[in-house]
Interface confidence: medium
């Protein structure tokens, strides 16, 4: 009696199942009681000897490519061996690599977590994923895993993480890059500093006093509000960041506490108060303002 090994499908794709069947065309299963064993190269597969002429392999991988055969043993211990059958497992090259961010849109608050998710639409087997920052040649991280997506995490984002990123995927057919994704790090404003600038060391009534408010950190645009004794004097915008100034023509009523507030939509911060007092220097006829 002749023995045949049939693999279905005969040219499997990585990750897909394969059924091996040990066939005896000229013998009915009722004619004799057989034990079956399947082999790859020199190694027995599955449970070893079994009464089933079929062996189900849940997932085939590139490294499972090889020469397969089966043996059948009768109750009288006669062993039949099939011819070797070559099974080539086909690897699907990676295709359509994309990079996405969590949070979506690539906008993240300083100190928050950022995840760069690299995905491939197609590809089988061990896929190597790499993440790159800007034009720096060395990668941030690389991972090899049997999945279509992989993640690179920045647990606490810093200002220096604001850059363009891309990822690369590869499974033995050469590297494929994703498109570039821009990361914007949103920084809440720091406590602003209020400075008073006068045209001379001791400003007099009718002089123009400049109130300059500046938050040293914070994503633009920043809106600055100016206050005298908690009464709003006005506001100024700094579209590109930096500080802003408010000019005031001095009168005797302008004595008192001044402060400013910076707001960039991520939180507001108020400066310390600066006090202005009118003094009358000895021998002087006009009022002067000191801070």
């Amino acid at each position: 009696a002749e023995l045949f090994l049939i693999a279905s499908p005969s040219h499997p794709t990585e990750g897909s199942p394969v059924t091996l069947t040990c066939k005896m065309p000229f013998l009915q299963s009722s004619d004799a009681q057989f034990q079956f064993c399947f082999f790859r190269d020199t190694r027995a597969l599955g449970p070893g000897w079994s009464s089933s002429p079929k062996l189900q392999i849940a997932a085939m991988w590139k490294e499972d490519t090889g020469s397969y055969w089966c043996e059948a043993q009768t109750m009288a211990s006669k062993v039949l061996r099939s011819r070797r059958s070559q099974i080539n497992v086909h690897r699907v090259p990676v295709a359509d690599v994309s990079l996405e961010t969590q949070p979506p849109g690539g906008q993240v608050m300083e100190g928050d977590r950022l995840v760069l998710i690299c995905s491939v639409a197609m590809g089988t087997g061990d896929i190597t994923f790499l993440w790159y920052k800007g034009a720096v040649g060395l990668n941030l991280q690389s991972k090899t895993q049997r999945s279509l997506t992989a993640e690179y995490e920045i647990p606490s984002v810093r200002e220096s993480d604001a850059e363009q990123y891309y990822c690369v995927a590869e499974n033995g057919y050469g590297p494929s890059p994703s498109g570039l994704v821009s990361i914007t790090v949103r920084i809440p404003v720091s406590r602003p500093i209020l400075m008073l600038r006068a045209p001379r060391a001791q400003a007099a009534v009718e002089d123009v006093l400049e109130l300059h408010c500046e938050a040293l950190r914070g994503s633009p645009p920043i809106l600055y509000w100016f206050y005298h004794e908690d009464i709003t004097l006005g506001s100024r915008s700094a579209p590109s960041g930096g500080g802003a100034s408010f000019n005031l023509s001095l009168t005797e009523e302008h004595s008192g506490n001044y402060s400013c507030e910076a707001n960039n939509g991520l939180g507001a911060q108020r400066s310390e108060a600066v006090t202005l007092n009118f003094t009358v220097p000895t021998g002087a006829r006009s009022n002067h303002l000191t801070s």
């Epitope: 790499l130 040649g137 060395l138 941030l140 690389s142 090899t144 690369v168 050469g174 890059p177």
Partner: antibody, heavy 118, light 107 residues
């Protein structure tokens, strides 16, 4: 400042062995893939071997001409990569550069000269 | 193995000129090409990767272009320090292979 410093080159007879070392500093060595590239007047620049990072299971790749004779290895704790060269041939003569990067070579050492001659 | 052919062993140019160095791959390598500059007695330096991405610190007079099998490194407004050997490299598949190099010389 990035530095790659090769050592271990010299004169060796055909059939002999030699081990090259490369000490790295100034970048995150554990994340980098490390390669050896050699250069000779006859063959120009020739990629020799690569060892990937721990995240890539330290996978190794070799040029066909050195497969079975050369072994690349790394010690991340020492930020060092090595090239063990056995059964050396006259055609293995050249300057051996230690390089770092992924696919393309970003960082290069100054090279160490290996001369295989009777 | 993929063969990278740099057909011009030498190229003559003058300071201030524009020069194009070509490299041809024996099969389609997509955009997986890097370019290196090597000055006499020194190790190579990375200029370009992904066929057209300039490496950090590389002057913008160096431009890479091409995809598939034909690649070009263009140096506009050549400076005296650009006189060196230039090599292309493919990283589409192992083994990585280099071109034989093009030496840029002054006329």
């Amino acid at each position: 400042e990035v530095k790659l410093e090769e050592s271990g080159g010299g004169l060796v007879q055909p059939g002999g062995s030699m081990k090259l070392s490369c000490a790295a500093s100034g970048f995150t060595f554990g994340d980098a893939w490390m390669d050896w590239v050699r250069q000779s007047p006859e063959k120009g620049l020739e990629w020799v071997a690569e060892i990937r990072s721990k995240a890539n299971n330290h996978a190794t790749y070799y040029a066909e001409s050195v497969k079975g004779r050369f072994t690349i290895s790394r010690d991340d704790s020492k930020s060092s990569v090595y090239l063990q060269m056995n059964s050396l041939r006259v055609e293995d003569t050249g300057i051996y550069y230690c390089t770092g990067g992924n696919y393309w070579f970003v960082y290069w050492g100054q090279g160490t000269l290996v001369t295989v001659s009777a | 193995d993929i063969v990278m052919t740099q057909s011009h062993k030498f190229m003559s140019t003058s300071v201030g000129d524009r020069v194009s160095i070509t490299c041809k791959a024996s099969q389609d390598v997509g955009s997986t090409v890097a370019w290196y500059q090597q000055n006499p007695g020194q190790s190579p330096k990375l200029l370009i990767y992904w066929a057209s991405t300039r490496h950090t610190g590389v002057p913008d007079r160096f431009t890479g272009s091409g995809s598939g099998t034909d690649f070009i490194l263009t140096i506009s407004n050549v400076q005296s320090e650009d006189l060196a050997d230039y090599f292309c490299q493919q990283y589409s598949s192992y083994p990585f292979t280099f071109g034989s190099g093009t030496k840029l010389e002054i006329k």
